[in-house]
């Protein structure tokens, strides 16, 4: 066992001489992003104050390619890198094409309305006039490709002109536009060469030891890894913590059960019920508030102040009133819960599916005519699953080196 341990320690660290270095650098696991849109069936009725009705469309599946660049080894047992992602649509795996039309809330209009609720009436009326002049409405009919990767909208230019610095988009607006062909920030992580217990743990993200999006030190902490590998020799008491730039926060998953993936022993880690709980139900999350119902996390502070919320798909594990407020939602543990299956000896994921939903809080705002009589509601826009499973040559090598070889050595 000590010989096996030595082999593992030697080969999991981030070092060009280690077996797993190339796997860390260019993840050989094929990753897929499956996106499901909530097509709004009754936009006119919503504007009259009726309950929203949605229909899930998809999946629209993209192959996700990741590669690390600007890899710099520092002299404090850390390595810095940028990881770029590109997405390629997979028609054969998708239920529909990128040219499919989806009726969705106009995030720019409805988001701006909620953001301006407490602004002077005059300013809201001017925005109404601006929206009218530009032909902007509360709901829009756009293609999957446009919603994902961006569409030209004169409102983007208007926002940039009159509210400079507020908006990360130039010319085009798309929900996944910032992710494609771009990096998720500069990660500096421990290599484990000098101290294996800290391997993969994030030292800094974009030069920061903590973020300032939230209202408590605990919520602002950058904990865990960058979400791809974890320290070796896990036990059922271990937790799986990682910092997610997309959620602008650290997340902690808990051990659920042991299993086997393609002959390789695994530990399954899942989201605790408290992951998106509000502060009154789970006090440590108070720093993520102001909160609405439990089970959704307000990410407006890191998403250009728009009233956007992150949750499990279909408001799984959230306050039931959220799913009840929208017709067409059916939360289901099997279909909508996220998991990571990790090889506990190495801390390397074998099979995972991270599922999250993005929703928009919308309501009627006095002075902004485009909001009509919309009743306050958290309306799901889409949910996605980022999934990957080890396969082929990588799986074979992994199985041979880390399952077969130790067995042979043991005897």
């Amino acid at each position: 066992p000590s010989l096996i341990k030595q082999q593992v320690l030697k080969n999991v660290r981030i070092d060009p001489s280690s077996l797993s270095f190339n796997m860390w650098k260019e993840i050989p696991i094929p990753f897929y992003l499956s996106v499901y849109f909530f097509d709004v069936m009754n936009p006119s009725e919503i504007l009259k104050g009726e309950k929203p009705q949605v229909r899930e469309r998809g999946p629209y599946v993209y192959r996700e390619f990741r590669h690390k660049s600007n890899i710099t080894f520092n002299n404090n047992d850390t390595v810095s890198f940028l990881e770029y992602r590109t997405f390629q649509f997979q028609p054969s795996k998708s239920h529909g094409s990128e040219s499919d039309y989806i009726v969705m809330p106009n995030i720019l209009v409805l988001g701006a309305a909620v953001m301006m609720e407490n602004k002077p009436m005059t300013l809201k009326l001017i925005m109404t006039l601006a929206f009218t002049t530009l032909g902007e409405r509360a709901f829009m009919n756009r293609t999957v490709g446009e919603i994902m990767w961006g569409y030209k909208d004169p409102l983007v230019n208007l926002i940039n002109k009159y509210f400079p610095g507020m908006f990360p988009f130039k010319d085009k607006f798309g929900l996944f536009a910032e992710l494609n062909n771009s990096d998720s920030g500069l990660f500096t992580v421990f290599t484990g060469v000098q101290n294996i217990s800290r391997i993969h743990l994030v030292d800094k993200w974009n030069g920061l030891s903590k973020v300032d999006f939230w209202h408590s030190d605990q919520c602002n902490m950058i904990n865990g890894t960058s979400g791809q590998m974890w320290p070796p020799f896990m036990t059922p008491e271990s937790s799986l913590e990682f910092y997610s730039p997309e959620a602008c926060r650290s997340m902690k998953l808990m051990y659920k059960e042991s299993g086997v993936f393609e002959g390789i022993p695994t530990y399954r880690f899942v989201a605790p019920k408290t992951l998106f709980a509000n502060g009154s139900i789970y006090p440590p999350n108070e720093g993520f508030c102001p909160c609405l119902e439990s089970g959704i996390q307000n990410v407006s502070t890191c998403r250009f102040s728009a009233p956007l919320f992150l949750s499990h798909p279909h408001f799984l594990n959230a306050d039931p009133v959220l799913a009840e407020a929208v017709t067409g939602l059916h939360p289901n543990q099997e279909a909508h819960s996220l998991f990571l299956d990790i090889h506990p000896v190495t801390g390397i994921p074998m099979n995972c599916s991270v599922k999250l939903q993005l929703s928009l809080y919308m309501k009627s705002v006095a002075g902004i005519g485009q909001t009509g009589k919309i009743e306050p509601v958290v309306l799901p826009l889409l949910w996605f699953a980022e999934s990957g499973a080890m396969e082929g040559e990588t799986l074979h090598t992994f199985y041979t080196q880390l399952v077969l070889m130790p067995k042979v050595m043991h005897y």
Epitope: M121, T122, I126, L129, L158, Y162, F163
Partner: antibody
Framework: QLQLQESGPGLVKPSETLSLTCTVS????????WSWIRQPPGKGLEWIGN???????DYSPSLKSRVTISVDTSKNQFSLKLSSVTAADTAVYYC??????????WGQGTLVTVSS | QSVLTQPPSASGTPGQRVTISCSGS????????VNWYQQLPGTAPKLLIY???QRPSGVPDRFSGSKSGTSASLAISGLQSEDEADYYC???????????FGTGTKVTVL
């Protein structure tokens, strides 16, 4: 070319109500927001309030209790009423068109003197 | 009602650069964009700069605006005699809920 023209009495007695009308020509009153601004002699500008064609108003907190702005879309006009005036209300009163850019068009202004 | 603070006067010789400051707070300049108005003697004000640094068509490019935090400034480079006027900054204010103007600055061309 959009033009604004203020009209109304140039002299108002203390404690009475000041009434002014602004006529908009060369454009529709339904297209923008319309404002009243005043400037006491030798002093700076003070915003009084705005009106939207639908009748929604927004007033300066310091004048809110005494101000009423109304609109007549059929005549392409909007009006200002300021009650219980005192000598401190003596000023040049301007009407203006308000857009996201700011006060983009102004009337030439009308001097209203409060005196007995 | 709160107002934005400007120096009462500024002056320069023809061709010189003159800068006018406008100081506010987080409830106005800090959370809004700033406009500048020029009022020539005996006339109505005219929009000179909008959204901190944008010039409406017809405004010479010697006029420029900027904003940083809770302050803004207007610069006139290459001062000309016809620039002799009163200049006012303006912004939205969240606390009294409306438009507030600066105290005004009289620019004199020496």
């Amino acid at each position: 070319q959009l033009q604004l023209q203020e009209s109304g009495p140039g002299l108002v007695k203390p404690s009475e109500t000041l009434s002014l009308t602004c006529t908009v020509s060369g454009g529709s009153i339904s297209d923008d927001l319309w404002s009243w601004i005043r400037q006491p002699p030798g002093k700076g500008l003070e915003w009084i309030g705005n009106i939207y064609y639908s009748g929604i108003t927004d007033y300066s907190p310091s004048l809110k209790s005494r101000v009423t702005i109304s609109v007549d879309t059929s005549k392409n006009q909007f009006s200002l009423k300021l009650s219980s005036v005192t000598a401190a209300d003596t000023a040049v009163y301007y009407c203006a068109r308000l857009t996201l850019r700011g006060f983009q068009n102004w009337g030439q202004g009308t001097l209203v003197t409060v005196s007995s | 009602q709160s107002v934005l603070t400007q120096p009462p006067s500024a002056s320069g010789t023809p061709g010189q650069r003159v800068t006018i400051s406008c100081s506010g707070s987080s409830s106005n300049i800090g959370s809004s964009t700033v406009n500048w108005y020029q009022q020539l003697p005996g006339t109505a004000p005219k929009l000179l700069i909008y959204s901190n640094n944008q010039r409406p068509s017809g405004v010479p490019d010697r006029f420029s605006g900027s904003k940083s935090g809770t302050s803004a400034s207007l610069a006139i480079s290459g001062l000309q005699s016809e620039d002799e006027a009163d200049y006012y900054c303006a912004a939205w204010d969240d606390s009294p809920n409306g438009v507030i103007f600066g105290t005004g600055t009289k620019v004199t061309v020496l």
